[in-house]
C-alpha cells in the first residue's frame, strides 16, 4: 500500500466545509481495504506560534528541522501528550463516523478523502489517513494533513496571504 | 532567559499530601508539554508525570497513578504537581522539565526536595 | 516498559582522552518516522541534568560538538572525542518513544 495526502497543510475560516485529500494505491486488490482517519490533537500550539514566527520558540524550532528534515514538532510527540480520536472508517460504501464526530456532517468521499461539511473550533488538529488491508502489508499505509481553523476576527492574512474574510453571515 | 523554578517542597509525614510548583520565564510556556522528574538521594533519574501544552491531557508513572496529580495555569506560567498520600519512597528532588521536539527534556529546573518521613 | 540499560557504570576517564558510553534498551525506539527516540543527558556534581543528545545523534543547542550519539533500534552509544575536566559527571540515556525511562546512569570522573 502506499498512501498519500497530496496537501498536507489546511487553514479554513470556522463554520467553512474543507477536504482533507488522501489517496492510495495497492499492488494486489482482492478486497476492498478499510480506511481509518485519526485525530490527533497538535503536540504544541500551532495556532500561537503562527501567530508569532520571530518568537525565540519559532526560531529554536526552525534549527530543529534544519538538522532534522521532515521532522514537524507540532505532529511529531507520543499519544500520551494528546488527544487521540477515531473520526470515520470506510470498508466498501459505508462509512462510520467516531463516538465523538456522531451528528456531524463528515464523510469520507473518493478514494479516501475526509470532507467536513463545516469545521467546528475543536477541529483543528494533525488527521492521519490510514489504509489497512490483509493483503497488502508493504509500503507506506499513514499518511497527515494538519488542519488549522481560525474564527473571522483571527489575523487570518498571516496564515493565508491574499485571503479575505468576508462578513460574517447570520 | 529561559527559566524553571521549583518550589513547595518540605518535610512531610507519611499519608500527608505536599504541592509543588514550578515558575515558567523566558519563553511561551502555553506552547509546551510539561514534565516532572524525581531524584531520589544518590539514586537515579525517575519520570513522574506530563502534561499537554493546554491541560487537557496527563499522564503519569504507574509507581504515582491515583497519588499525584499534574496540573497548569498557563495565565500564571505555572506547573503543578499535587502529591497526596506521600510515602517514604516518594523522598525526592522533583524537577520540572520542558518537553521540546523529539520528546527530550531541554530545560530542566533547579530542583525541589521533598522529605516523607515520620 | 521499556528498560534502558548503561554500560558501564563507572568509567575513569583521562583528559584529552576519548570515552564511550553504552546504552541498550529492551526494545527497538525507532519510529516510523525514521527517528530513534533516544536522548543522552549529564548531569554534573551538584546540578540538575542537562541535555546533551536527542533524537539518537542531535546535538542540543550550546553542546560542544566531542560529543556524538549513534545507533539504531535498541543499541545506543555516546562518544565523547577528548574528554575535558567539566565533563564528569553522571550520564543518562533515557528512551523517549513509549513514556519515558532513564538508565541507571554512568558515572564518569577523572582517572
Known amino acids: 500500500i502506499q498512501v498519500t495526502v497530496s496537501d498536507p497543510y489546511h487553514v479554513v475560516i470556522l463554520f467553512q466545509p474543507v477536504t482533507l485529500p488522501c489517496t492510495y494505491q495497492m499492488t494486489s486488490t482482492p478486497t476492498q481495504p478499510i480506511v481509518i482517519w485519526k485525530y490527533k490533537s497538535f503536540c504544541r500550539d500551532r495556532i500561537a506560534d503562527a501567530f508569532s514566527p520571530a518568537s525565540v520558540d519559532n526560531q529554536l524550532n526552525a534549527q530543529l528541522v534544519a538538522g532534522n528534515p521532515g521532522y514537524n514538532p507540532y505532529v511529531e510527540c507520543q499519544d500520551s501528550v494528546r488527544t487521540v480520536r477515531v473520526v470515520a472508517t470506510k470498508q466498501g460504501n459505508a462509512v462510520t463516523l467516531g463516538d465523538y464526530y456522531q451528528g456531524r456532517r463528515i464523510t469520507i468521499t473518493g478514494n479516501a478523502d475526509l470532507t467536513f461539511d463545516e469545521t467546528a473550533w475543536g477541529d483543528s488538529g494533525v488527521y492521519y489517513c490510514s489504509v489497512v488491508s490483509a493483503q497488502d502489508l508493504e509500503g507506506n499505509n499513514e499518511a497527515y494533513a494538519e488542519l488549522i481553523v481560525l474564527g473571522r476576527t483571527s489575523g487570518v492574512a498571516e496564515l493565508l496571504p491574499g485571503f479575505q474574510a468576508g462578513p460574517m453571515e447570520d | 532567559q529561559v527559566q524553571l523554578v521549583e518550589s513547595g517542597g518540605g518535610l512531610v509525614k507519611p499519608g500527608r499530601s505536599l504541592r509543588l510548583s514550578c515558575a515558567a520565564s523566558g519563553f511561551t510556556f502555553s506552547s509546551y508539554a510539561m514534565h516532572w522528574v524525581r531524584q531520589a538521594p544518590g539514586k537515579g533519574l525517575e519520570w513522574v508525570a506530563v502534561?499537554?501544552?493546554?491541560?487537557?491531557?496527563?499522564h503519569y508513572a504507574d509507581s504515582v497513578k491515583g497519588r499525584f496529580t499534574i496540573s497548569r495555569d498557563n495565565s500564571k506560567n505555572t506547573l503543578y504537581l499535587q502529591m497526596n498520600s506521600l510515602r517514604a519512597e516518594d523522598t525526592a528532588v522533583y524537577y520540572c522539565?520542558?518537553?521540546?521536539?523529539?520528546?527530550?527534556?531541554?530545560?530542566w529546573g533547579q530542583g525541589t526536595m521533598v522529605t516523607v518521613s515520620s | 516498559d521499556v528498560v534502558m540499560t548503561q554500560s558501564p557504570l563507572s568509567l575513569p576517564v583521562t583528559p584529552g582522552e576519548p570515552a564511550s558510553i553504552s546504552c541498550r534498551s529492551s526494545?527497538?525506539?525507532?519510529?516510523?518516522?525514521?527517528?530513534?527516540?533516544l536522548d543522552w543527558y549529564l548531569q554534573k556534581p551538584g546540578q540538575s541534568p542537562q541535555l546533551l543528545i536527542y533524537?539518537?545523534?542531535t546535538r542540543a543547542s550550546g553542546v560542544p560538538d566531542r560529543f556524538s550519539g549513534s545507533g539504531s533500534g535498541t543499541d545506543f552509544t555516546l562518544k565523547i572525542s577528548r574528554v575535558e575536566a567539566e565533563d564528569v559527571g553522571v550520564y543518562y540515556c533515557m528512551q523517549a518513544l513509549q513514556t519515558w525511562t532513564f538508565g541507571q546512569g554512568t558515572k564518569v570522573e577523572i582517572k
Open positions: 502534561i499537554s501544552y493546554d491541560g487537557s491531557n496527563k
Open positions: 533524537l539518537g545523534s
Open positions: 526494545q527497538s525506539l525507532l519510529h516510523s518516522n525514521g527517528y530513534n527516540y
Open positions: 522539565a520542558r518537553d521540546s521536539p523529539g520528546n527530550a527534556f531541554d530545560i
